[in-house]
């Protein structure tokens, strides 16, 4: 019924009985219900439960419950279901963010770049080029640039200087090492895990896309490739780097170096005799599901004073 809605004391609302023209003060109905009959001079208001597909979030004096928002469009997922007390809330699945009303995959920061700001379901990842003394050797939407291993601090020597894309390679001084194997031609090198905190991935990295909840999702992982030194200036139309690739690195001496490097494992690098073949495979690097916030997707635009 048409009513002039005026602010009233909590728990009551003003109702105009249109048959008589009288302005009445009625008790509100609880959240999850609506006013099926307004009060009169002689009777209390009557409340009824919101039918399926509708809701009221607060105590109210409205004559019908609000319709719930439409089912979540793919690839969005429900954060809150449609229920008598709550509207349906849709969010982007882990690894994606809301952009122009749909979900786009979080940008993958390429090798040599790290995450400056984590992505959320509402915001894309922001990448930055790894600064001097840091590196990122895997394309990732969650990994930050990591500090080069401090060889000297480990009483080791730098065998190979790290870059933006590779870590330092440390080696033991053969003359001073007490762990040098007795076999000739073998020297032991160490790649201790650095102590800087970083995201520990929770799912396997897949270069072709995300672990989406929607198998029909056409979203693909976008890799940011630097176009200049500044952060966030990289186009996203290049294909992603393979997540599994051989990283056989050769030292100045002929023996091959097996460098099984993962951001969350401790690895020892060893020089092997040249007669032995090394087939180092990069351990799978994972994507961490972003933390979920509480966005209101498709909020109801109407505002009813009788509902507050």
């Amino acid at each position: 019924q048409p009513e002039q809605k005026t602010l009233s004391l909590t728990g009551t609302y003003r109702h105009v009985d249109r048959t008589t023209g009288q302005v009445l003060t009625c008790d509100k109905c609880p959240a999850g219900t609506y006013v099926s009959e307004h009060c009169t001079n002689t009777s209390l208001r009557v409340c009824s439960s919101c039918p399926s597909g509708t809701f009221t979030r607060h105590e109210n004096g409205i004559e019908r419950c609000h319709d719930c928002s439409q089912p979540c469009p793919r690839p969005m997922i429900e954060r809150l279901p449609c229920a008598a007390l709550t509207d349906r809330e849709c969010i982007c699945p882990p690894g994606m963010y809301q952009s122009n009303g749909t979900c786009a995959p979080h940008t993958v920061c390429p090798v040599g770049w790290g995450v400056r700001k984590k992505g959320t379901e509402n915001e894309d990842v922001r990448c930055k080029q790894c600064a001097r003394g840091t590196f990122s050797d895997v394309p990732s939407s969650v990994m930050k640039c990591r500090a080069h291993t401090d060889c000297l601090g480990q009483n080791l020597m730098v065998v190979k200087q790290g870059t933006k894309e590779t870590d330092n390679v440390c080696g033991v001084h053969l003359s001073s090492s007490s762990t040098t194997p007795s076999s000739p031609g073998i020297a032991t090198f160490s790649h201790p895990e650095h102590t800087e905190s970083h995201d520990v991935p929770s799912s396997t990295y897949e270069p072709q896309g995300m672990n989406s909840t929607d198998s029909n999702s056409t979203a693909s992982v976008r890799t940011k490739v630097p176009s200049d030194i500044q952060e966030e200036t990289v186009p996203d139309n290049t294909s992603s780097t393979s997540g599994k690739e051989s990283t056989n690195r050769t030292l100045p001496n002929p023996p091959q170096l097996t460098h099984q490097q993962g951001p969350h494992h401790r690895h020892i690098l060893k020089l092997l005799p040249s007669s032995m073949e090394a087939t180092g495979e990069k351990s799978s690097t994972a994507i961490k599901a972003p933390k979920r916030g509480h966005p209101r997707q498709n909020p109801h635009k109407h505002f009813d004073i009788n509902e507050h």
Partner: antibody, heavy 113, light 107 residues
Framework: QVQLQQSGPEVARPGASVKLSCKAS????????LNWVKQRTGQGLEWIGE????????YYNEKFKGKATLTADNSSSTAYLQFSSLTSEDSAVYFC??????WGQGTLVTVSV | DILMTQSPSSMSVSLGDTVSITCHAS??????IGWLQQKPGKSFKGLIY???TLEDGVPSRFTGSGSGADFSLTISSLESEDFADYYC?????????FGGGTKLEIK
Amino acid sequence: QVQLQQSGPEVARPGASVKLSCKASGYTFTDYYLNWVKQRTGQGLEWIGEIYPGNNHTYYNEKFKGKATLTADNSSSTAYLQFSSLTSEDSAVYFCTRGVIKWGQGTLVTVSV
Amino acid sequence: DILMTQSPSSMSVSLGDTVSITCHASQGIRNSIGWLQQKPGKSFKGLIYHATTLEDGVPSRFTGSGSGADFSLTISSLESEDFADYYCVQYAQFPYTFGGGTKLEIK
């Protein structure tokens, strides 16, 4: 007993204004909305608008905005309808009503040269 | 605006007959409809409100029914004082709108 007593018939020239009154009795004037309705022969009934004397809040039918003005005088429990820039289209019987149940007897307005 | 379509526009009936007048709303109005009676040269009298509730002092031969968009007023055992014009009015939404009226005449 609720009563709505309306003013007598009006004859007016085109372009002029008229102000009709509706005196309420038998209830608390400031507790109820009062409506005004236009009835033209062969044209049916049209709702003009309403006023709540309790706070002078008014609500108009879009069609009558700028044409009709609703006011109320609480001291005399009287509501008023003023019609401006009269044309022959405004010739009609005007009713004040409390809700849809209680009606005044109507006021005939004739616009003629 | 909600359009109220009332039918018939007129009907000739005899004393003691039972008649029904219908009103169709162009959209659902729940039960926010009233029925009015107007005698020639006179004002209006409210008969029914909230679709089915009889106003005080109105004879029980008047009954209202319907909800949503289709409503009717039934007058049973017509008496001479019942010959008049009848209108429906919706008050679910501004502006209030009225049916075109039904003229009840003696056959």
